[in-house]
């Protein structure tokens, strides 16, 4: 339905508060280095303009597309060339090329200072002094650091952020009330950002069909009682929402997401019995709740899949005449029966089924050729099952920190060219799979673990894409979305790698390590571990363990010393020498 003024349409649909918040998010995700005040000024100008269009849709420029309006506004930033360099060239382009150009310049790892959390009293004062600015600043800081954060979901986070301050700044012990809530929001926010980044990568690198296949599998697991036609409709709508958000069309995305939540709640009887509570909540909570809702119970007495997908005489005809529908139905039927499988495994099975039909249907006896296709699934199912079993055993044996270290060593040996901060970040996140998923019963382990690993490996892929250094990473990241994890799992030690020159400076530590939080201290130690492996990729587990134990003892000793700095200097030299000897450097 065409509207005379798109900006007026979205302003009316979303309301002023959400409109302003979403425009701020959009601008901060595009111009990640711009100061907060500059963005607020731009947002206010766009909002005033939108109001004129609401008053008169025929007013000048009100008929322009949102990309044109927003792009024109971004291109008025005076410091564009000196701050962003070649991104300024985008402004010489016409829409839609200009927006595509802005999208290509989004930076997954912007050079921004770490967000330091002020004292609770300072935060509460700032919150009370100007609540609106305080919350806008939250949106701005998150959006610029996470340029693909799912915008309507960020509104939900901001609502919870506000609620935390509203409640806790009145509490007797403000810190005890507020800090756990902020920690939870931070951790959930990072997870949400990473999950959305995978959705955008799926759409942008592998196309709409890849995303739709993922959505069919996931929604079929979640809504196994829904008919295929219903799931297909939800998939189409969900794909539109995520395509818009990943494309920077945040107003349309938020509007369409609200419409989708409304539709789901109006039709919950034919979708899922688990939606009742979600649908009683306000909009932002409702949408979040639907996105996280537990899987509905599987219908009783589902027939065998073989009848329609192996035994039927029409298998090849149905496949050839409408692959998308037939393979979509296969994926739907398989997924609704297997909430115990990861989405990526289901997609591998569907791909194997498709490949088999493509190979067999033109053969003299197609049925004989594909009759055993389900037998081909067995090794595909067993591979992640075995991997998860082994790694959960290792996790239970080592605990999270040492499990992360095992993964750090494993991945540094596989892809030693990758930067140390990226290896540390990715391996730490890979290691979190243990505490996140190994506690689950068998039936929930695989969907938890393998789909989480897909999200984490995508972080590696997007960070590596910015500055590619390893052909092996590029290959695993680009060849197949669903086979990324098996591809990385299959990598052995990179025998072509020339070990890094030893640099004592890398292993020189100072007293400041003593004041760090436990997490930051772990990161320091893990950074040293990666560097050790880069210097000595052939080092054994035992050698690395001995060096790391010595290192931990050294830090502990010097942090207890009276003259910490002298201890770090003198004992540090001894440690470096001992480590070199132990590793034969």
């Amino acid at each position: 339905d065409a509207h005379k003024s798109e900006v007026a349409h979205r302003f009316k649909d979303l309301g002023e508060e959400n409109f302003k918040a979403l425009v701020l998010i959009a601008f901060a995700q595009y111009l990640q280095q711009c100061p907060f005040e500059d963005h607020v000024k731009l947002v206010n100008e766009v909002t005033e303009f939108a109001k004129t269009c609401v008053a008169d849709e025929s007013a000048e420029n009100c008929d322009k597309s949102l990309h044109t309006l927003f792009g024109d506004k971004l291109c008025t930033v005076a410091t564009l060339r000196e701050t962003y360099g070649e991104m300024a060239d985008c402004c010489a382009k016409q829409e839609p090329e200009r927006n595509e150009c802005f999208l290509q310049h989004k930076d997954d790892n912007p050079n921004l200072p770490r967000l330091v959390r002020p004292e609770v009293d300072v935060m509460c004062t700032a919150f009370h002094d100007n609540e609106e600015t305080f919350l806008k600043k939250y949106l701005y800081e998150i959006a610029r650091r996470h340029p693909y954060f799912y915008a309507p979901e960020l509104l939900f986070f901001a609502k919870r952020y506000k609620a935390a301050f509203t409640e806790c700044c009145q509490a007797a012990d403000k810190a005890a009330c507020l800090l756990p809530k902020l920690d939870e929001l931070r951790d959930e926010g990072k997870a949400s950002s990473a999950k959305q980044r995978l959705k955008c990568a799926s759409l942008q690198k592998f196309g709409e069909r890849a995303f739709k296949a993922w959505a069919v599998a996931r929604l079929s697991q979640r809504f196994p009682k829904a008919e295929f036609a219903e799931v297909s409709k939800l998939v189409t709508d969900l794909t539109k929402v995520h395509t818009e958000c990943c494309h920077g069309d945040l107003l349309e995305c938020a509007d369409d997401r609200a419409d989708l939540a409304k539709y789901i709640c109006e039709n919950q009887d034919s979708i899922s019995s688990k939606l009742k509570e979600c649908c009683e909540k306000p909009l932002l909570e409702k949408s979040h709740c639907i996105a996280e809702v537990e899987n509905d119970e599987m219908p009783a007495d589902l027939p065998s899949l073989a009848a329609d997908f192996v035994e039927s005489k029409d298998v090849c005809k149905n496949y050839a005449e409408a692959k998308d529908v037939f393979l979509g139905m296969f994926l739907y039927e398989y997924a609704r029966r297997h909430p115990d499988y990861s989405v990526v495994l289901l997609l591998r099975l569907a791909k194997t089924y498709e490949t088999t039909l493509e190979k067999c249907c033109a053969a003299a006896d197609p049925h004989e050729c594909y009759a055993k296709v389900f037998d081909e699934f067995k090794p595909l199912v067993e591979e992640p099952q075995n991997l998860i079993k082994q790694n959960c055993e290792l996790f239970e044996q080592l605990g999270e920190y040492k499990f992360q270290n095992a993964l750090l060593v494993r991945y540094t040996k596989k892809v030693p060219q990758v930067s140390t901060p990226t290896l540390v970040e990715v391996s730490r996140n890979l290691g979190k799979v243990g505490s996140k998923c190994c506690k689950h019963p068998e039936a929930k382990r695989m969907p938890c673990a393998e789909d989480y690993l897909s999200v984490v490996l995508n972080q590696l892929c997007v960070l590596h894409e910015k500055t590619p250094v390893s052909d092996r990473v590029t290959k695993c990241c680009t060849e197949s979305l669903v086979n990324r994890r098996p591809c990385f799992s299959a990598l052995e030690v990179d025998e072509t790698y020339v070990p890094k020159e030893f640099n004592a400076e890398t292993f020189t530590f100072h007293a400041d390590i003593c004041t760090l939080s436990e997490k930051e201290r772990q990161i320091k130690k893990q950074t040293a571990l990666v560097e050790l492996v880069k210097h000595k990729p052939k080092a054994t587990k035992e050698q690395l363990k001995a060096v790391m134990d010595d290192f931990a003892a050294f830090v502990e000793k010097c942090c207890k010393a009276d003259d910490k700095e002298t201890c770090f200097a003198e004992e540090g030299k001894k440690l470096v020498a001992a480590s070199q000897a132990a590793l034969g450097l």
Epitope: K323, A362, A364, P366
Partner: antibody
């Protein structure tokens, strides 16, 4: 040597019918899918349809109804009815690469036979 | 409707030149079902590349296919005298009935 050899082309009046043949030698036809593709003078290639080894046929949307593909042990046929001037073209038969059923990968082609529809 | 657009429709080049031909499909092809053919006057087409980037056996490595989804490219890295011909892309879709070819790019001697 594997060969595909078309025959049966010629001049036909508008509204008339024609049956083209594609004789296959050097391979066992019962294991392969064969396509018909045409090319009007100086124009694009146009896929007409396919017959799988099992005898199942599929046609381009525009070709359904007027064109029929069939086969016997060594020959594939293209029956063309209600011919029009715009059907004037060189008609080729071509084998689909083994291991594919619906992909446009044709590794062996005949030399083509010209069909002219004119009064 | 399926639309497969090849560009340019013709290109003049010299021996040793690098030649790039593009093929745009709407909608996207199914599962990288994209082929490239070479056709010389009075002859049948010859399959060069399948699955967007795989070289048919016997085809020289100067021919390279790339792309996915809707946008595909055939590159001849160093044009040889025998490469002057017309090149067609072919696409496969969700329905076999939609199998379509582009209208060709003629590579001529400059």
């Amino acid at each position: 040597e594997v060969q595909l050899l078309e025959s049966g082309g010629g001049l036909v009046q508008p509204g008339g019918s024609l049956r083209l043949s594609c004789a296959v030698s050097g391979i066992d036809l019962s294991n392969y899918a064969i396509n018909w593709v045409r090319q009007a003078p100086g124009k694009c290639l146009e896929w007409i349809g396919i017959i799988w080894a099992s005898g199942t046929t599929f046609y381009a949307t525009w070709a359904k109804g007027r064109f029929t593909i069939s086969r016997d042990s060594t020959t594939v046929y293209l029956q063309m009815n209600s011919l029009r001037a715009e059907d004037t073209a060189v008609y080729y038969c071509a084998r689909t690469v083994p291991g594919y059923s619906t992909a446009p990968y044709f590794d062996l082609w005949g030399q083509g036979t010209l069909v002219t529809v004119s009064s | 409707d399926i639309v497969m657009t090849q560009s340019p429709s013709s290109v003049s080049a010299s021996v040793g030149d690098r030649v790039t031909i593009t093929c745009q499909s709407s909608p996207s092809v199914w599962s990288n079902f994209l082929s490239w053919y070479q056709q010389k006057p009075g002859k049948a087409p010859k399959l060069l590349i399948y699955e967007a980037s795989k070289l048919t056996s016997g085809v020289p490595s100067r021919f390279k296919g790339s792309g996915s989804g809707t946008d595909f490219t055939l590159t001849i890295s160093s044009l040889q005298p025998e490469d002057f011909a017309t090149y067609y892309c072919g696409g496969g879709y969700s329905s076999i009935s939609d199998t379509t070819f582009g209208c060709g790019t003629k590579v001529e001697i400059k």
